[in-house]
């Protein structure tokens, strides 16, 4: 190999060991029989050398540095050449470095031809191995602007006082052009300006200077986004840290077209703007840091550009001003993403503050809109608390558990509407009365409606799930001893049409000791399946539940249990079941931990089934499933 550098070219070539393959025979640069691992060639020198190995690219790297001095004379602006030409260099991983020094008052602009650049974060690499590392200067301090790959949106980077651009090319890469040019500009009065151009839909991830280390103190950095007018841009902060400010405040400022409040100032922890039409600027402003404990300011953010959806121009009013203790969250439903570019799906408050999820609270009227290609990607979860603190005031008081129509009119599917029902301990209990009798969901007879009510204890220490209930069954009411949550969960978009079938009234009633009482009025047409609460996990220790089963005068009820034994093994106490005729009060008692379960029995009058648990040994839980079937009486036994 021969490398000859013209005089006055201000180019230095350095060949040095890279990161050697540890278990390889060392390789050397050989110059007139001398073996060396580092060779420096300066302007005006001509050197002939060879390598002592067959594959020097596995051992050595080459750095070609050109110093461009804009301090003492005119600057060589225009397209930057790769010098010496890559064809004259040994095939090693090569880094071309251009170090431009200029006066503080002079702006320098790097312009990148197509393909534009894409910034990468720490630990990331470029697919083709070609990387652009760009740094600036503040006095004597070097500031890393960022590392970039090809195929992105960054078209120009403006700096002042100097710029260092390093282009890394793998040994096998055929590239023979720098891909950028340098122009002079007036002073930009800040650390740098990065221009990012979107031709169509897409996203860009960008980072503050020195990321993931700290942004220089009291500096200003600007990103200019060029977005076609027919598209919308949204900004989301992926990661940020704030330093400890002594004076001034760290912030981001937006210049947004058409905004009457430019610049719009946001804290880094604020929700950032979305649904912006056309070009906009974002600036990051640092502060004067505390000398003792400066901390670090850093920011990594994403700009998502996409077509506005029809929904993005519609404003929906969610009036929660008359509600109390209620919150509504619109959020992405969990899905596996497969598409390469997934347009963002945002919900916007007042059309401007957009994010992937939004929580609205009671007491206010909210205006929301959507910036989303497919609203089925979102769903709604609502929580409302109805609590009684004074038992004298609440007794016999009723509340309707209805989804407010404002919520049903939103173009997003309701997933859960949860009512937390709270009562004073040992003073009051609750009764749930449905507008339409309920069916308990079981494997034998699953619910196939568009929604169900999930009823569970709301006492933190108690793991008690009464079950899932849907309209169209035989359960007339459910009484529960203490705090519960009732969740209306939807399963199909057709819930909108079936919303009229929802309707549940909760009343506060005098306290009773049983955990739950189900009032069942079976229909003659169908078999009613009932199961103990906490199915699969077992009825909690020492818990008692009852079913009040009505039998019409002209019918006979057949009570059937679906296994021979309960399977429960008691650690302490006894588990038992009482079946009691309501008219005669005659009762049968079964020891669930010892006896076999009763064979199918016939009841001509209304009766009770009461199941009380012991403290079972782990793994031997109490789970019972039974059915009630009505058949006409053939003989009048009265």
């Amino acid at each position: 190999f021969e490398i000859a550098l013209p005089r006055e070219s201000n180019i230095t070539v350095l060949i040095k060991l890279g990161t050697p393959t540890l278990l390889a025979k060392p390789c050397y640069i050989v110059i007139s029989k001398r073996h060396i691992t580092m060779l420096s060639i300066k302007s005006g020198e001509r050197i002939v050398f060879t390598f002592s190995c067959q594959s020097p690219e596995n051992h050595f790297v080459i750095e070609i540095q050109k110093n461009i001095d804009c301090m003492s004379g005119p600057c060589p602006f225009g397209e930057v050449q790769l010098q010496p030409s890559t064809s004259l260099l040994p095939t090693l991983n090569r880094t071309f470095i251009w170090d431009v020094k200029a006066h503080k008052s002079i702006g320098l602009e790097l312009q990148f031809s197509i393909p534009r650049l894409r910034q990468i974060g720490p630990g990331e690499s470029c697919p083709d191995g070609v990387t652009h590392s760009i740094s600036g200067r503040i006095d004597a301090t070097v500031v890393r602007i960022g590392t970039f790959c090809s195929n992105g949106t960054v078209s120009r980077i403006k700096m002042q006082e100097g710029v260092k651009m390093a282009l890394h090319l793998p040994w096998f890469h055929p590239r023979n052009v720098s891909g950028f040019s340098i122009a002079n500009r007036s002073s930009i009065k800040r650390l740098c300006i990065i221009e990012s151009v979107f031709e169509g839909e897409g996203s860009a991830t960008l980072m503050s200077a020195n990321y993931p280390e700290g942004f220089p103190e009291d500096e200003l950095m600007t990103w200019q986004f060029v977005v076609p007018a027919h598209l919308r841009a949204s900004v989301s902060f992926l990661n940020f840290n704030l330093s400890n400010c002594e004076r001034k405040e760290e912030r981001v400022e937006y210049y947004i077209p058409g905004s009457t409040t430019n610049p719009e100032v946001f804290k880094l922890e604020d929700k950032q703007p979305g649904n912006m039409a056309g070009n906009f600027n974002l600036s990051l402003q640092g502060c004067d840091q505390d000398a003792q404990s400066p901390g670090i300011l850093r920011l990594q953010f994403q700009v998502l550009v996409q077509h506005p959806q029809n929904e993005s121009n519609k404003i929906y009013v969610v009036d929660l001003s008359n509600e109390r203790a209620m919150s509504l969250t619109i959020e992405p439903r969990p899905v596996k993403q497969s598409r390469k570019f997934v347009p963002g799906c945002f919900v916007c408050l007042e059309s401007r503050t957009c994010s992937s999820n939004l929580t609205l609270t009671s007491g206010s009227k909210h205006k929301i809109s959507f910036l989303c290609d497919d609203l089925t990607r979102l769903w709604m979860n609502v929580e409302k608390t109805i609590s009684c603190t004074d038992h004298r005031y609440c007794q016999r008081k009723s509340y309707s558990l209805q989804v407010p129509s404002d919520i049903l009119h939103l173009p997003v599917e309701l997933h859960d509407f949860s009512w937390k029902l709270l009562v004073p301990k040992d003073r009051l209990s609750l009764v749930l009365v449905p507008a339409q009798k309920l069916q308990q969901h079981t494997h034998e007879k699953p619910c196939n409606t568009s929604f169900s009510y999930l009823v569970a204890s709301a006492i933190p220490s108690q793991d008690l799930y009464f079950g899932s209930f849907c309209p169209g069954g035989s359960i007339k009411q459910i009484q529960v001893k203490q705090n519960i949550s009732v969740t209306l969960r939807t399963f199909a978009p057709s819930f909108q049409q079936e919303a009229s079938r929802q309707g549940l009234t909760v009343s506060f009633i005098p306290y009773f000791k049983e955990e739950g009482v189900f009032t069942v009025t079976p229909d003659t047409k169908s078999k009613v399946y009932l199961r103990t609460p906490n199915w699969d996990r077992g009825l909690p220790s020492l818990t008692s539940v009852s079913w009040n089963i009505s039998v019409p005068r002209d019918q006979v009820a057949c009570l059937t249990f679906f296994k021979e034994r309960s399977g429960v093994v008691c650690q302490t106490g006894r588990a038992f079941m009482i079946i009691q005729e309501q008219r005669t009060r005659a009762e049968e008692i079964f020891s669930l931990d010892e006896d076999v379960l009763p064979k199918p029995s016939f009841h001509h009058h209304s009766f009770w089934v009461n199941i009380s648990n012991c403290s079972p040994t782990s793994g031997k839980q109490l789970d019972l499933l039974f059915s009630v079937t009505l058949t006409p009486r053939t003989v009048d036994l009265t």
């Epitope: 040095k16 060991l17 050697p20 540890l22 278990l23 390889a24 025979k25 580092m38």
Partner: antibody, heavy 116, light 106 residues
Framework: EVQLKESGAELVRPGALVKLSCKAS????????MYWVKQRPEQGLEWIGW????????IYDPKLQGKARITADTSSNTAYLQLSSLTSEDTAVYYC?????????WGQGTTVTVSS | DVVMTQTPALMSASPGEKVTMTCSAS?????MYWYQQKPRSSPKPWIY???NLASGVPARFSGSGSGTSYSLTISSMEAEDAATYYC?????????FGGGTKLEIK
């Protein structure tokens, strides 16, 4: 097991010639640089030179050019150091070693005493 | 030739004490290698490529440096660390050793 076994101690007359051997086992010398180091009594280490057994290329410390000659026989997996025109200055322990960037194997050393 | 200068030539340390020895090259070298030698034994490769410990070397040893200035550090001296340590450059032939630092235990 990787080993470099050097030939036994030598007592030689001034002006004579000696040839030390270093037989490798557990690795192929063609994949390594084989080099020799001299250590005079109570002194430090001095690099003598090396051979690339794959192609026979050698390098020597210029101070020992003409004094030392390194050869290798890949068929017997052995490296050799020949020292000529011996003087009392050549009395030392001679170590052979094989090296990669991150791996080195050393022999136990051969003591050469030059005495009349 | 690249001249390697090790300092100090002789030092002693108490058990548990932190020990640092240095190696200075007369011109810039890519990496530094270190060897440990005990009396009547062959030198043992100790640190390669400036900062990597050879197989079997205790983690209390570390190496650092660049250009012309390198060092070997023992975070907490132990009796078995008493030996002579040599640095060597493999960057430019002849591949010279330093004069050695003899480390004794107090």
């Amino acid at each position: 097991e990787v080993q470099l076994k050097e030939s036994g101690a030598e007592l030689v007359r001034p002006g004579a010639l000696v040839k030390l051997s270093c037989k490798a086992s557990g690795f192929n010398i063609k994949d390594y640089y084989m080099y020799w180091v001299k250590q005079r009594p109570e002194q430090g280490l001095e690099w003598i030179g090396w051979i690339d057994p794959e192609n026979g290329n050698t390098i020597y410390d210029p101070k020992l050019q003409g004094k030392a000659r390194i050869t290798a026989d890949t068929s017997s997996n052995t490296a050799y150091l020949q020292l000529s025109s011996l003087t009392s200055e050549d009395t030392a322990v001679y170590y052979c070693a094989g090296r990669l960037y991150a791996m080195e194997y050393w022999g136990q050393g051969t003591t050469v005493t030059v005495s009349s | 030739d690249v001249v390697m200068t090790q300092t100090p030539a002789l030092m002693s340390a108490s058990p548990g004490e932190k020990v640092t020895m240095t190696c200075s090259a007369s011109s810039s070298v890519s990496y530094m290698y270190w060897y440990q030698q005990k009396p009547r034994s062959s030198p043992k490769p100790w640190i390669y490529l400036t900062s990597n410990l050879a197989s079997g070397v205790p983690a209390r040893f570390s190496g650092s440096g660049s250009g012309t200035s390198y060092s070997l550090t023992i975070s907490s001296m132990e009796a078995e660390d008493a030996a002579t340590y040599y640095c060597q450059q493999w960057s430019s032939d002849p591949f010279t050793f330093g004069g050695g630092t003899k480390l004794e235990i107090k």
